[in-house]
């Protein structure tokens, strides 16, 4: 649901905010299929808008636009920018567009400035999860106006969404268009319920937040505002105490057993046959350990039958 209501904003002059996006996509919090290379876990640039209730960049349970599809699938912002600009020109529903640089790792920060005014007090943005089929995080219509005042700050935990345009199950799934297109759905620890899904953690009631956004109102002062550095990799400048990083348990996953091998031995002492399976997913963070990967069984050799 949109985070803003239909209440009329009667705040005074336009307000400036700093928006800080913090990636929390770590291998500890999200150990399953965590992308380590080609490409490693990272975030696209952030693209957002300050707008009125006449405009919707994206909304849960609704279909995304072509522009948002391109952004969610490939990180291409051009078509989405054009759609935002068109909404601004036709309906005057968009006041300003803002963007922040990409975050080159799963954990880190990026920041931007934005301005809202009382007719355009809602903020929406999207950041693509890289790599992914069409997954993103973002905010839909967060209202920074609180009656006759501007909110001093706002902070939200962010969770992954599926744009409904690509049917891939995993971070690195090849392109596989969803036909017909589906609506935007939240990805949870149990939905999609397929064990192959990269966010499928059946032992968790809910996923830990994969990102967080903080908006802080900027006070007008004679001194020029100095925005934070655009990208702060968390290993150097982690805001959150590392003890608070959730350790999501990842259970070992093994393949099905192979077929039984030949029965070796002879007719007096009988024989043994064996079968094997392999580790699909190594356990992490105190997840269930892997079971035996080889099994032997007694058997009657073929030439004794």
């Amino acid at each position: 649901q949109p985070l803003g209501g239909e209440s009329i904003c009667s705040a005074g002059a336009p307000a400036k905010y700093s928006i800080t996006f913090t990636g929390k996509w770590s291998q500890t919090a999200f150990p399953k299929q965590y992308p380590l290379f080609r490409p490693p876990a990272q975030w696209s640039s952030l693209l957002g808008a300050a707008h009125s209730s006449d405009y919707s960049m994206w909304r849960k349970n609704q279909y995304v636009s072509n522009g948002l599809r391109d952004f969610a699938e490939r990180g291409e912002a051009w078509a989405l920018m054009k759609e935002i600009e068109a909404a601004g020109e036709a309906l005057q529903s968009v006041h300003a567009v803002f963007s922040a640089p990409a975050v080159p790792s799963g954990t880190g920060q990026t920041s931007a400035e934005l301005e809202v005014q009382r007719r355009h007090s809602l903020v929406s943005f999207v950041v693509r999860i890289v790599p992914s089929p069409d997954w993103f995080v973002g905010v839909d219509s967060l209202d920074l106006c609180d009656g006759d005042r501007w909110r001093e700050q706002a902070a939200l935990d962010l969770y992954p969404y599926d744009a409904g345009t690509d049917s891939g199950f995993t971070f690195s799934s090849p392109n596989f268009a969803t036909i017909p297109q589906d609506t935007v759905t939240e990805i949870t620890s149990s939905s999609p319920s397929h064990p192959a899904n990269s966010f499928y953690y059946p032992r968790l009631k809910a996923l830990p937040p994969i990102a967080r956004v903080t908006l802080v109102r900027l006070r007008q002062s004679p001194r020029a505002f100095i925005p934070p550095a655009p990208v702060l990799p968390s290993r150097d400048n982690e805001i959150v105490d590392s003890a608070s990083v959730p350790e999501t348990p990842l259970d070992c996953e093994v393949s099905l057993w192979s077929s039984w091998g030949l029965c070796g031995g002879h007719c007096g002492r009988l024989g043994t046959k064996s079968r094997t399976r392999y580790v699909r997913v190594q356990p992490a963070n105190n997840g269930s350990p892997c079971p035996e990967l080889e099994e032997e069984a007694e058997c009657v050799p073929d030439n004794c039958v």
Partner: antibody, heavy 124, light 107 residues
Framework: EVQLVQSGGGLVHPGGSLRLSCAGS????????MHWLRQAPGKGLEWVSV???????HYADSVKGRFTISRDNAKNSLYLQMNSLRAEDMAMYYC??????????????????WGQGTMVTVSS | EIVLTQSPGTLSLSPGERATLSCRAS???????LAWYQQKPGQAPRLLIY???SRATGIPDRFSGSGSGTDFTLTISRLEPEDFAVYYC????????FGGGTKVEIK
Amino acid sequence: EVQLVQSGGGLVHPGGSLRLSCAGSGFTFSSYVMHWLRQAPGKGLEWVSVIGTGGVTHYADSVKGRFTISRDNAKNSLYLQMNSLRAEDMAMYYCARWGYYGSGSYENDAFDIWGQGTMVTVSS
Amino acid sequence: EIVLTQSPGTLSLSPGERATLSCRASQSVSSSYLAWYQQKPGQAPRLLIYGASSRATGIPDRFSGSGSGTDFTLTISRLEPEDFAVYYCQQYSSSLTFGGGTKVEIK
């Protein structure tokens, strides 16, 4: 002393049943593959059945479906349940241990310990 | 199944003589999976040789086995009085079969 002591033989009518027992002592019974063999009067030796350490069983075609081999490791015992007995089943029955034991060790890789034998007579 | 043929059927020898018993298989016995047993009247068989040539525990060294493939031999270098008995060969390569036996009797 390593030994196998048999019991349970006797006279039975054709079509009747009999259960033979074989008690092992002096060795880790559960670790060995055990067999039943028989020897008709004045004839040679014939293999009857085998049971592995894991319970896998196998039978000679001549007794398949009529005889059942089993073991009770807690009692260090081997059994042969014989049903639908025929005249041609009359023989001296022996239980025997297959001497192979352990991994990579092939000590006495054959029937190394035999029971004393028990006679099964099938007659009307 | 593999048929084992023992020869001779009876061997008449005196104590101190050398005994040579033959066992021929109808097809090759893999990995020398062949054993020899001794049986005296009213007794259970006793293991002498396994793996065609390995002496079982406690068997005197006058007993020796040899051969591979289809032809196997049990040799008793010097017959002792207690050696007069019936000898069986047995293969465990394909199913479990015994030869018909060779009786070694006192001449």
